[in-house]
């Protein structure tokens, strides 16, 4: 009785269960009743990352420096090359096919999370008591100056973009 389903790591072909090729190898010829599945290793610039019956290996991803990409991890016969972006740039998508410059946080916003090769800068509004007066991809919101600790008084209130202005206390005569 020919099988209608096969075990894990097998596939059904012409009423016969054949072994899949292991990761890093491609299918050359299906099995027969007398011969095991024929598989061949992928060449140096290729890979297959699953148990498969592919007749062609996949090409390793090319990290194109013209798109700001660089190799984070070299591919093997079983894994694809992993690209990342050069310093100051990050990937535009999860597959990291191109890079764009990190965004800066505008005045009134501070850096919550510094950008990496794969993620952009995350900005947050400066809360009351904090400010940022620069456009930066690195600087967090800074706390307003504490006039009291300097034995001074607030002459001008701070905003999310400006620090407070301290001045001497008025001496009462």
């Amino acid at each position: 009785e020919p099988p209608t389903a096969c075990r894990e790591k097998q596939y059904l072909i012409n009423s016969q269960c054949c072994s899949l090729c292991q990761p890093g190898q491609k299918l050359v010829s299906d099995c027969t009743e007398f011969t095991e599945t024929e598989c061949l290793p992928c060449s140096e610039s290729e890979f297959l990352d699953t148990w498969n019956r592919e007749t062609r290996c996949h090409q390793h991803k090319y990290c194109d420096p013209n798109l700001g990409l660089q190799v984070q991890q070299k591919g093997t016969s079983e894994t694809d090359t992993i690209c990342t972006c050069e310093e100051g740039l990050h990937c535009t998508s999860e597959s990291c096919e191109s890079c764009v410059p990190h965004r800066s946080c505008l005045p009134g916003f501070g850096v919550k999370q510094i950008a990496t090769g794969v993620s952009d800068t995350i900005c947050e509004p400066c809360p009351v008591g904090f400010f940022s007066n620069v456009s930066s991809a690195f600087e967090k919101c800074r706390p307003w100056t504490s006039c009291e600790t300097k034995d001074l008084v607030v002459q001008q209130a701070g905003t999310n973009k400006t620090d407070v202005v301290c001045g001497p206390q008025d001496r009462q005569r």
Epitope: N14, C31, F34, E36, E38
Partner: antibody, heavy 117, light 109 residues
Amino acid sequence: QVQLVESGGGVVQPGRSLRLSCAASGFTFEKYGMHWVRQAPGKGLEWVAVISYEGEKKYYADSVKGRFTISRDNSKNTLYLQMNSLRAEDTAVYYCARDTSRGHDIWGQGTMVTVSS
Amino acid sequence: EIVLTQSPGTLSLSPGERATLSCRASQSVSYSYLAWYQQKPGQAPRLLIYGASSRANGIPDRFSGSGSGTDFTLTISRLEPEDFAVYYCSDYADYPPFTFGGGTKVEIK
């Protein structure tokens, strides 16, 4: 390169025995089924026997059943055909061939067996 | 047991001509597992076509196979001097036994 080389042929009297060998090289012998195919002088091809990669399954043509035995030694990359009770009609060139889902893709050069008194 | 009948028995043609060889099976060949082999005098057979229509490695594209079920054809589009030989069809799905056709001899006219 992938190669099959037969040996052991010769002239033998009817009723006697002969053992043919087929030495394989250039591929993973233990993964492939193997066949013996013969060709009588001036005639066509006749399939004789097949053995599975691990040696468990064996099939024979009716004309040789009970007289011929196919076997293999994977540690020596060698296929055998033990031929007993030979008859004049067994006179032929004997080829070994590799089994694949593409048919018999690699053949040896053949070895001549002549059964004559 | 499947019986394969090849025709014609002999084909007399000149180099550059087209050769059409037929192989008829007594019953349908499973999965089109039909192969064609070429054999020259004093040599072992060589696999040309498998799966009825796929060329084996290194086989020139002037050789082509077609057909399914019970009727199969090997075509040599333009005969080269080295193509004059005997051609066999073979069913390698429905075993035992594996069967070969009687052969077609392609000779120089």
